[in-house]
Structure formats: C-alpha cells, structure tokens
Interface confidence: low
C-alpha cells in the first residue's frame, strides 16, 4: 500500500547501512516532477542535512549538505537512469568514505561524506512521488 | 477535508473567471517547498500550458507558458507574500489582457495573456502543498 509523502522516519546510519526506497514519479518527465531524500541530524525538518539528494526527473540530480543552516557546495549530475512513468528502486548505501546511490540495481551517483553518517537521526522522502517502500537495513555485526 | 494532490479538474475559463485555491506548504520555507498551478489546453498532463505559476516558497515565483511542447520566456518575481507555515488563499482572475494573482487578498503577480484563456481545458494544482479548497467561479452574464 502507499506510504504518506512527505515520509519521515527515525534512522541511525553507519558504514554498511542501506536505505531502500521504491516509488514512482507523480507526473510525466516533461512536467519535471522532483524526488528528494534528506538525511537529517535531528527529528526536525529545519535541522542540518548530512546528505541531500534531489532528482529533477528527466533533467538532473543535485546533491549537497546543509551545515549550520547553510547550503554548501552543490554536486550536480546529468546521469538520468530513471524512466518516465516507471517505478524506481533507489538504494543509498553507506560506504566508509561516501554514499553510493543505486537506481534499479545500477550504481548511479556517489557523494563523499562531509559529516559522519552517524550524525543522521532522521530520513525524509518527499516531493512529487508516490511511495510504496521505505526500509533501512543495518549490516549484521 | 483535504483534497488529493496532484489535484486535477476540468475547467473552462474566460474573462471574469476566477480560480481560487486554499492550501498550506508541506514543509518549512528553509526546505524550499513548491506550489505549482498549471492551466492546460487538454485533459492530458503533457499538453501545452497557457499559464504556469510556480512558487518556490520563501524564494521566488516563476510564471511561463508551454507552447507546442516548449517553454517560452520565463517571468520571475521575488515578491513573497506567502508566510512560512501559514495557510494561504490564492486567487487567479482572468482579466481581459492578463491573469491577476491575489495572495491572501493582496494583488501580488500579473501575467499577460500569450494564449487566449478560452484555450484552457484543465487546471492542475500540485507539488508540496496540502489543499483544502479548489473552486472555479464564472462571471454571471
């Protein structure tokens, strides 16, 4: 069944953790729907963002961090593995030095850690998507 | 009660018509939620857009038209009468030569007609808002 959007969940992340999201754009790519995933340092939407991942479907992806309330250096990619009108599965894996973002099983983006992933307390998924799955898996110790 | 978003309704517009929308941003302005209202020429989301009105809350408003599938000259305004976290009432009135956009009873934006308003067949309201009212009123002849 559908999950509410914006979708917010408390989360603890460390090397080996993976966040998995399954959803679908709510509009055709011509209309430029967005998907956004934010890893926050607090259970407050105005808190700092360790990893900000925003897709403008059909156009580009931007990644960034928000530190002490200010956006830092934006990283942009024109890689667009998402398909117009199709369901997507997005997984964000915490590697020792970076986040690795897979789209439909294909490694698509990376973002070097600026703040340690252990600082993450909440994940929010929002903007112009319907959401059918959200899961945080932890590496078994 | 809440209306679903994206919200789509068939509509016929002409001089004297007013589209009224009541809603609330789904996120704090720091996170830059959007509101978008599109006046389409067909009951298809990929159809041309006679009037495109997009608010990036707390930052700016852009207005445009999409003709034969291509976006035209964008009009931008930094005027920001919307309040962080507050409900808004937006009304778009069809004047003989332009659209007049009122926010909370205050004239805030105008957009000259590029395509006659009679070409509009559908209105879509979407992006990062909750929606409590949508109404199209017609001037009594």
């Amino acid at each position: 069944s559908l999950l509410p959007v914006p979708y917010t969940e408390a989360a603890s992340l460390s090397t080996g953790s993976t966040v998995t999201i399954k959803g679908r754009p709510l509009a055709c790519f011509l209309n430029e729907p967005y998907l956004q995933v934010d890893f926050h340092t607090e259970m407050k939407e105005e808190s700092d963002i360790v990893f900000h991942f925003q897709v403008c479907f059909g156009r580009r992806v931007v990644m960034n961090s928000r530190e002490y309330g200010a956006w830092k250096q934006q990283v942009e990619s024109k890689n667009m593995p998402f398909q117009d009108g199709q369901e997507f599965e997005l997984s964000i894996s915490v590697l020792p030095d970076k986040y690795q973002v897979m789209v439909n099983g294909q490694s698509s983006y990376t973002f070097d850690h600026r703040i340690k992933p252990e600082a993450v307390k909440m994940v929010q998924v929002w903007r112009d998507i319907s959401l059918t799955k959200f899961n945080v898996s932890y590496l078994k110790r | 009660s809440l209306l679903p978003v994206p919200y789509t309704e068939a509509a016929s517009l002409s001089t004297g018509s007013t589209v009224t929308i009541k809603g609330r941003p789904l996120a704090c302005f720091l996170n830059e939620p959007y509101l978008q209202v599109d006046f389409h020429t067909e009951m298809k989301e990929e159809s041309d857009i006679v009037f495109h009105f997009q608010v990036c809350f707390g930052r700016r408003v852009v207005m445009n038209s999409r003709e034969y599938g291509a976006w035209k000259q964008q009009v931008e305004s930094k005027n920001m009468p919307f309040q962080d976290g507050q409900e808004f009432e937006l009304s778009i009135s069809v004047l003989p030569d332009k659209y007049q956009v009122m926010v909370n009873g205050q004239s805030s934006y105008t957009f000259d007609h590029r395509i006659k308003p009679e070409a509009v067949k559908m209105v879509q309201v979407w992006r990062d808002i909750s929606l409590t009212k949508f109404n199209v009123s017609y001037l009594k002849r």
Epitope: S1, L26, A27, T132 | L3, P4, P6, T8, K44, E45
Partner: nanobody, 121 residues
C-alpha cells in the same frame, strides 16, 4: 494491498445504458482516489472518470453528461453509470485506485483486470 474486480460489462445497443461496478478488497479503500480508464484494441489507455476520497469528481470531455462516477466507502465499491452509449465507447473498462486524484494512469497503483463494453450501432 488493494485488489479490484470489475463487473457489469456487456453488449448493448447505441443509446442504451450499462452500470459498471468495481469491488475493492482491503480496509483502506476509503483512503484512495478511484478512477475508470478504458482501452480499445490498438489504442492507448484513456481516462474516463475519477472520484476523490470525499466524492469530488471529474470526467473526460467525451463522456461528460453521459457517465456518472460514484463510490460507496461502506461497501468498498465504485460505480460508473453509463447512459446514451455510443459505438465509440466500446472498450475494456478498467477500475484503478491510487493515492492521488488524477487522470494520469501512472498515478494509480492498483488496477483491475477490466470488463468489456461493446456498443453496437
């Protein structure tokens, strides 16, 4: 998970009426917007009508004034009353459920198998 089963299709003469029903399983029926789409052989799936959770509705221009969509949240059903049928209404009619109120097929996550409507002249 929502499962949808349509019924009420059949063969009817032009000018006649049919009433299509869609029965939904699952306790969350009332939280979904519902719609009817139709698909004629060799053609794209076409929006017919949609209804919000609270009963607001919209129709395709081609059926406006002839078709009426309604829902009964207590019985988990959505109904399409089709009057003044025309040969061009011939198609397989599919019921759909989704989290958004839209005429776009991709906005609906759950679909029925469809019921055939044939209008003869």
């Amino acid at each position: 998970q929502v499962q949808l089963v349509e019924s009420g299709g059949g063969l009817v003469q032009a000018g006649g009426s049919l009433r299509l029903s869609c029965a939904a399983s699952g306790r969350t029926f009332s939280t979904y917007s519902m719609a009817w789409f139709r698909q004629a052989p060799g053609k794209e799936r076409e929006f017919v009508a949609a209804i919000t959770r609270s009963g607001g509705n919209t129709y395709a221009d081609s059926v406006k004034g002839r078709f009426t969509i309604s829902r009964d949240n207590a019985k988990n059903t959505v109904t399409l009353q089709m009057n003044s049928l025309k040969p061009e209404d011939t198609a397989a009619y599919h019921c759909a459920a989704g989290g958004t109120y839209s005429f776009v097929p991709r906005s609906y996550n759950y679909w029925g198998q469809g019921t055939q409507v044939t209008v003869s002249s």
